[in-house]
């Protein structure tokens, strides 16, 4: 497959990935499958740095990030590790909260006004960011 | 100038296979998802499925799920429906369209006519 | 599946008319709809996105509004070659799903 070097058009490049911001809402695996379909996934938060990067561009609006735990255990949509990486989630969350009345808890991960995360019902729509690094070989299966 | 240009329709027996092609040009093609929507004579607009620039990720209507496979060839710019199992209801014009940002079809090719018949 | 409903069905007007086509989601799709015009034999062209947002080369008589649910497109002033018929897509979620259309003929 060919490699990116550059980002496409309306995508902002940071650190050596290339990060595109709604401007409306979706639901989470709407926004998910939004992602896929640009050959990225819903953003990674590896960093505080990152954070702040993101955090600068969405401003205090409630935005779904690549981090979900509707099987289980939390997991990263790219499968960095969640145990092991960098949190952000306001006090006392995630909390999986039932009191919505929706149905169910909480399963995904949004950036709330101030930029820290709170997980919250997945068919909410938010806003999200998709992420795609450079340089990695695209996904482009083999011709038969 | 862009342009989208289907071909390879035609009538087939019911079970039986075709495979649609869609030449682009104009654009880049390779950084742009592109779907498949089909029209049967005298109805409206049914979205068929959808392919990423790589073609790493597809989705399909309930309707031709696990009988359609889409697929791509960035180094010939062509995008290609495979249509197995077809049926009588599978019959209409076929086009290929460009996705846009706001996830709707910004450029349409002139449609292929499949007609599936015994 | 999200299912999507116009009205009217058909709608006759006079050149320098104003028209207004109004489009219903079965569920909120915010502001993800988009409008074509599609002439007999012809493939659709997308006239507009997002809702409202006018496509390059479209006339600026075509204008769209709505969020949520229900959504309007609106011709300031009919043309002869406006006669054609107005279709909205739902591009909230897969799967895409299309109106039935609206039919504008001459009266």
């Known amino acids: 497959g060919s490699e990116r070097t550059c980002c496409p058009v309306n995508w902002v490049e940071h650190e050596r990935s290339c990060y595109w911001f709604s401007r409306s809402g979706k639901a989470w695996a709407d926004a998910d499958n939004y992602c896929r379909l640009e050959d990225a996934h819903l953003v990674v938060v590896t960093s505080w740095e990152e954070q702040k990067f993101v955090q600068h561009h969405i401003g205090p609006v409630n935005t779904w990030m690549g981090l979900h735990d509707q099987n289980g255990p939390w997991k990263w949509v790219d499968g960095t590790d969640y145990e092991t990486g960098f949190k952000n989630w306001r006090p006392e969350q995630p909390d999986d909260w039932y009191g919505h009345g929706l149905g169910g808890g909480e399963d995904c991960a949004h950036f709330t006004d101030d930029g820290r995360w709170n997980d919250d019902v997945c068919q909410r729509p938010y806003r999200w960011v998709c992420e795609t690094e450079l340089d990695k070989a695209s996904q482009e299966p083999p011709l038969l | 100038e862009v342009q989208l240009l289907e071909s390879g329709g035609g009538l087939v027996q019911p079970g039986g296979s075709l495979r649609l092609s869609c030449a682009a040009s104009?654009?880049?093609?390779?950084?742009?998802?592109m779907s498949w929507v089909r029209q049967a004579p005298g109805k409206g607009l049914e979205w068929v499925s959808v392919i990423s620039g790589s073609g790493g990720s597809t989705y399909y209507a309930d309707s031709v799920k696990g009988r359609f496979t889409i697929s791509r060839d960035n180094s010939k710019n062509t995008l290609y429906l495979q249509m197995n199992s077809l049926r009588a209801e599978d019959t209409a014009l076929y086009y290929c369209?460009?996705?846009?940002?706001?996830?709707?079809?910004?450029?349409w090719g002139q449609g292929t006519m499949v007609t599936v018949s015994s | 599946d999200i299912q999507m409903t116009q009205s009217p069905s058909s709608v006759s007007a006079s050149v320098g008319d104003r028209v207004t086509i109004t489009c219903r989601a079965s569920q909120n799709i915010t502001t993800w709809l988009a409008w074509y015009q599609q002439k007999p034999g012809k493939a659709p062209k997308l006239l507009i996105s997002?809702?409202?947002s006018l496509q390059s080369g479209v006339p600026s008589r075509f204008s769209g509004s709505g969020s949520g649910t229900d959504f309007t497109l609106t011709i300031s002033s009919l043309q002869p070659e406006d006669f054609a018929t107005y279709i909205c897509?739902?591009?909230?979620?897969?799967?895409?799903?299309f109106g039935p259309g609206t039919k504008l003929d001459i009266k």
């Open positions: 104009g654009f880049t093609f390779s950084s742009n998802a």
């Open positions: 897509q739902q591009a909230n979620s897969f799967p895409f799903t």
């Open positions: 369209a460009k996705r846009n940002y706001d996830d709707a079809f910004d450029i």
């Open positions: 997002a809702a409202s």
